[in-house]
């Protein structure tokens, strides 16, 4: 029952798994559009390089009969079902694009002899780290933990003069797929984040979170959570917050902060938002399709996945090398290729590198402003605003452990 790869004699195909369960609730038509847009670009690039070949995508749709929740948590078998479909059809492309759910990817990796490259727009969990033929085009949890540890340790910036070694993590289990795995990585006792902290406690109930905001006996001033401002508001409301509390809101795939008319709501003043730069190249890109700010990154990852496939195809064909080899399957890492928004760098393990951006709310203008950026490729924090207009005392981030002298918190009666 050998599956033949449609991957030679001038015809090269990428198999795209179109799953009902995906990391983001993006209509499959948008994903298909992104793939097709990517194919157009790839064809142009190959033609410009003098390579007269055919490149196509075959879309493999899940029938949704067994798995109809549309939720990644129930997706363990869906990827395997799709692989069975491929197996029955005895037809497979050079590369597999998808799945995006961590459980599916992990299970497929476990249960199959993957001798071809797999590209995922997702698979955020630590369990998908260090997989030899897996490439991930959206920041995995490992990259987040590296940023947080780096930022916690930083103590030589004008606005952060204390190293931190403690944290609360709010995780109530209703999070989106990306947040679920990001918080999972922070919670895991074996993770880098846990290893580097002297105190960490996971808050699982709304009330636990709400109580900490004004608790004189709290063990840390820092709370990490994941979601958008609305998610925070539902939890925090207009409750009073002790003046030395810092909430780190992880919201990587949301470009809404970078819309010109956005004003930060008042409840965001104690919050630092960790998000991703919406393209940090001087050359403006024009990703023109009508996508919401939160969905753009997911569709873009599919598009970039196709461009990566094209890049590898071009490289191997120009060198006269065979595509259906273990060498090709293991080559989708430690490289930079021309993505839709500019260069995209993959690390030694095939995970995308990015520029993360930490935003704060200016008390003067009520606008979001960039505090610092972080380059995941070199694990380096670059301060941008040396004199931020913070809500915190002296416009500096507080220590993570409050001096237990006389209390100066503003009580709310």
């Amino acid at each position: 029952s050998q599956v033949s790869q449609n991957c030679h004699n001038g015809s090269y195909e990428i198999s795209v798994l179109m799953m009902d369960n995906s990391a983001f609730a993006e209509p499959l038509e948008n994903v298909e559009d992104a793939v097709n847009e990517g194919l157009e670009i790839v064809r142009g690039r190959l033609q410009n390089a003098g390579l007269n070949v055919t490149v196509n995508a075959s879309f493999m749709y899940s029938d949704g009969l067994i798995h109809n929740s549309g939720d990644c948590r129930s997706s363990t078998c869906e990827g395997l079902d799709l692989l069975r479909k491929i197996s029955n059809a005895k037809r497979m492309g050079c590369v597999l694009m998808g799945p995006s759910c961590t459980y599916s990817t992990f299970q497929m990796y476990l249960d199959t002899e993957l001798s071809y490259p797999m590209i995922s727009a997702g698979s955020f969990g630590l369990s998908c780290d260090y997989k030899e033929t897996l490439t991930r085009l959206m920041s995995p949890a490992r990259k987040l933990t590296y940023f947080l540890v780096n930022f916690w340790k930083t103590n030589d910036l004008p606005f952060k003069t204390y190293s931190w070694s403690t944290s609360y993590v709010y995780k109530n289990g209703t999070e989106s797929e990306d947040c679920f795995w990001y918080l999972n990585a922070l919670e895991a006792s074996v993770s880098y984040f846990s290893h580097e902290l002297s105190f960490k406690l996971v808050l699982r109930q709304d009330k636990e979170f709400q109580d900490i905001l004004m608790d004189h006996n709290r063990k840390s001033n820092v709370i990490v959570m994941c979601g958008d401002p609305e998610f925070l508001y539902k939890l925090k409301g207009d409750r009073a917050v002790a003046e030395d509390i810092v909430i780190i809101l992880v919201d990587l795939f949301n470009d809404q902060y970078f819309e010109d008319n956005v004003t930060a709501p008042d409840y965001m003043k104690n919050v630092l938002v960790l998000t991703q730069s919406p393209g940090n190249s001087l050359l403006n890109s024009s990703f023109s399709r009508n996508l919401s700010p939160t969905k753009r990154d997911f569709a873009l990852a599919y598009l970039n996945g196709i461009l990566l496939f094209g890049h590898m195809l071009k490289t191997f064909l120009e060198n006269g090398e065979n595509i259906t080899t273990p060498k090709f399957a293991h080559a989708f890492r430690n490289l930079t290729f021309e993505g839709y928004d500019g260069p995209v760098t993959l690390d030694d393990w095939g995970d995308v590198d990015s520029t993360m951006v930490l935003l704060y709310t200016s008390v003067d203008t009520k606008k979001y402003k960039v505090l610092l950026t972080y380059d995941t490729h070199v694990n380096q924090t670059n301060p941008v605003d040396m004199s931020p207009t913070f809500t915190w005392k002296n416009s500096k981030l507080p220590n993570d452990i409050t001096d237990r002298g006389p209390q100066h918190h503003h009580h709310h009666h």
């Epitope: 970078f258 819309e259 940090n280 001087l282 403006n284 606008k367 402003k369 960039v370 670059n382 941008v384």
Partner: nanobody
Framework: EVQLVESGGGLVQPGGSLRLSCATS????????IGWFRQAPGKEREGVIC???????KYADSVKGRFTISRDNSKNTLYLQMNSLRAEDTAVYYC?????????????????WGQGTMVTVSS
């Protein structure tokens, strides 16, 4: 009156670092996008980095990962930190400013320019 004054240029060995400053006056940094440009001998002027008024840095591919930009509003000054310098970074570096129409995008052109500061990378 808007003014921009660059400083910090000089001679540095390949692999070395320099920090350029751009002291500004006559406007509020929060309302302006600032760009660093450079012009090598016999070549056209090219954009190096822009910092949008919201504080988002945007880089030319040739300097990404080596150069960083920051600003200190309390001193009305911008800084360009240049690491791992190469011979091809040799140029006159200019600071430019433009009233921001967008908080997160770089302007297509700049209204105000400094006089420039020379950076020479050579062993």
């Amino acid at each position: 009156e808007v003014q921009l004054v660059e400083s910090g240029g000089g001679l540095v060995q390949p692999g070395g670092s320099l920090r350029l400053s751009c002291a500004t006056s006559g406007f509020t940094l929060d309302d302006y996008a600032i760009g660093w440009f450079r012009q090598a001998p016999g070549k056209e002027r090219e954009g190096v980095i822009c910092l949008t008024s919201g504080g988002l840095p945007k880089y030319a591919d040739s300097v990404k990962g080596r150069f960083t930009i920051s600003r200190d509003n309390s001193k009305n000054t911008l800084y360009l930190q240049m690491n791992s310098l190469r011979a091809e970074d040799t140029a006159v570096y200019y600071c430019a400013a433009s009233g921001a129409t967008s908080r997160w995008n770089c302007p297509p052109q700049y209204d105000h320019w400094g006089q420039g500061t020379m950076v020479t990378v050579s062993s």
